[in-house]
Interface confidence: medium
């Protein structure tokens, strides 16, 4: 692969755990203005596999608020508006990075953490296990 | 709200930009072992709004690899396996936090960045009603 030379203007680190411990500027560069998933689209209501959004709050985590999707039905909504159990509503999950205060309650010291969140739901054909 | 007292064992910060610049331990605490979305489930293929996963790589970002979903069709797959344009496949998007090397090419200095990623697709009733 291509080796990119280290920028000579990089800050030095005297931390004994370097490079595991790094400096992070929390002044977020944000290309997206809308952070409330309920406002960003109404897909959660219009989907054939609709979902509800649950607020998950944890002051020891950054971001402290994460929205979790929970599928409303086991089946999917058909053209009549009824739940069809020949299809399944399933959550689409994604691993995301969060910052966890470590040690706890410290304002300036964090550890990266990966968590699995459900972002929304999709309608899938079920895997049918045929009984022999 | 409840004020949580600061832990007396917190590291000190002499950074003039504190609390904007913090120390982060990159030794990730990960509850999830499977990071390849193609292995985690086959929903992307079984969905009525199937999607393809595209690898987005950026060495100046952490994580350097992010998988982006692109819906395969404008419409949704009906029970016969045909694409029906009376419904729409749409991407489910989520804002996630990533670390951007700042200054560029620095191994130990980052800035938090929010980016919008498409995680998967769901099938929705169109806002424009094709039939009045």
């Amino acid at each position: 692969g291509i080796t990119i030379p280290r920028n000579p203007g990089c800050p030095n680190s005297e931390d004994k755990n370097f490079p595991r411990t790094v400096m992070v500027n929390l002044n977020i560069h944000n290309r997206n203005t809308n952070t409330n998933p309920k406002r960003s689209s109404d897909y959660y209501n219009r989907s054939t596999s609709p979902w509800n959004l649950h607020r998950n709050e944890d002051p020891e985590r950054y971001p402290s608020v994460i929205w979790e999707a929970k599928c409303r039905h086991l089946g999917c909504i058909n053209a009549d508006g009824n739940v069809d159990y020949h299809m399944n509503s399933v959550p689409i999950q994604q691993e995301i990075l969060v910052l966890r205060r470590e040690p706890p309650h410290c304002p300036n010291s964090f550890r990266l953490e990966k968590i699995l969140v459900s972002v929304g739901c999709t309608c899938v054909t079920p895997i049918v296990h045929h009984v022999a | 709200g409840i004020t949580i007292p600061r832990n007396p064992g917190c590291p000190n910060s002499e950074d003039k930009n504190f609390p904007r610049t913090v120390m982060v331990n990159l030794n990730i605490h990960n509850r999830n072992t499977n990071t390849n979305p193609k292995r985690s489930s086959d929903y992307y293929n079984r969905s009525t709004s199937p999607w393809n996963l595209h690898r987005n790589e950026d060495p100046e970002r952490y994580p350097s690899v992010i998988w982006e979903a692109k819906c395969r069709h404008l419409g949704c797959i009906n029970a016969d396996g045909n694409v029906d344009y009376h419904m729409n496949s749409v991407p489910i998007q989520q804002e996630i936090l990533v670390l951007r090397r700042e200054p560029p090419h620095c191994p130990n200095s980052f800035r938090l960045e929010k980016i919008l990623v498409s995680v998967g697709c769901t099938c929705v009733t169109p806002i424009v009603h094709h039939v009045a």
Partner: antibody, heavy 116, light 107 residues
Framework: EVQLLESGGGLVQPGGSLRLSCAAS????????MGWVRQAPGKGLEWVSS????????GYADSVKGRFTISRDNSKNTLYLQMNSLRAEDTAVYYC?????????WGQGTTVTVSS | DIQMTQSPSSLSASVGDRVTVTCRAS??????LNWYQQKPGKAPQLLIY???NLQGGVPSRFSGSGSGTDFTLTISSLQPEDFATYYC?????????FGQGTKVDLK
Amino acid sequence: EVQLLESGGGLVQPGGSLRLSCAASGFTFSFYWMGWVRQAPGKGLEWVSSIRPSGGMTGYADSVKGRFTISRDNSKNTLYLQMNSLRAEDTAVYYCARDLGGMDVWGQGTTVTVSS
Amino acid sequence: DIQMTQSPSSLSASVGDRVTVTCRASQSISIYLNWYQQKPGKAPQLLIYGASNLQGGVPSRFSGSGSGTDFTLTISSLQPEDFATYYCQQSYITPRTFGQGTKVDLK
């Protein structure tokens, strides 16, 4: 083989009525929107009406609204077009078609002639 | 109602020619645009759906492009069996209007 077969066309006097049928085979009829398209002699195609899989939602061209009624019987795999108060300008070949947004399967057409 | 205007109304071409038919919608229809081919005495056949998707079984010499209000059907190398009338249709909103047709005949 996926097939649509129209019937019920014929000669009718102005003001009269006619009911067209379209028998579907080779696919799961109840999964699909269905529609009617007509073509007057020497003219282009004109969309007439469409109906959703359950039959719960229908749409009509302005030229036939209030006079034509689309319906379906999923148990019989059949699509219908009830045409009342027929006019000379309704003279055309009427096609039934499977409707996926684009009409991907068509019948051979049935001719309706409105004349005194 | 959305008006669909095709041009030209007719064109003469030779086998092997590249043929282009355009369709303009009176308002934006995103990519909800279909193209059909019809031969005399026959039912129409779907060629392209969703502006650019080739219907199964249709030769790859047919292609579609465009979005919003302006769309194009292209036949890269005209074959003898392609002499026919071509129609565009919007499926964005009811009524699902067709263009007036473009007749492609032998020069």
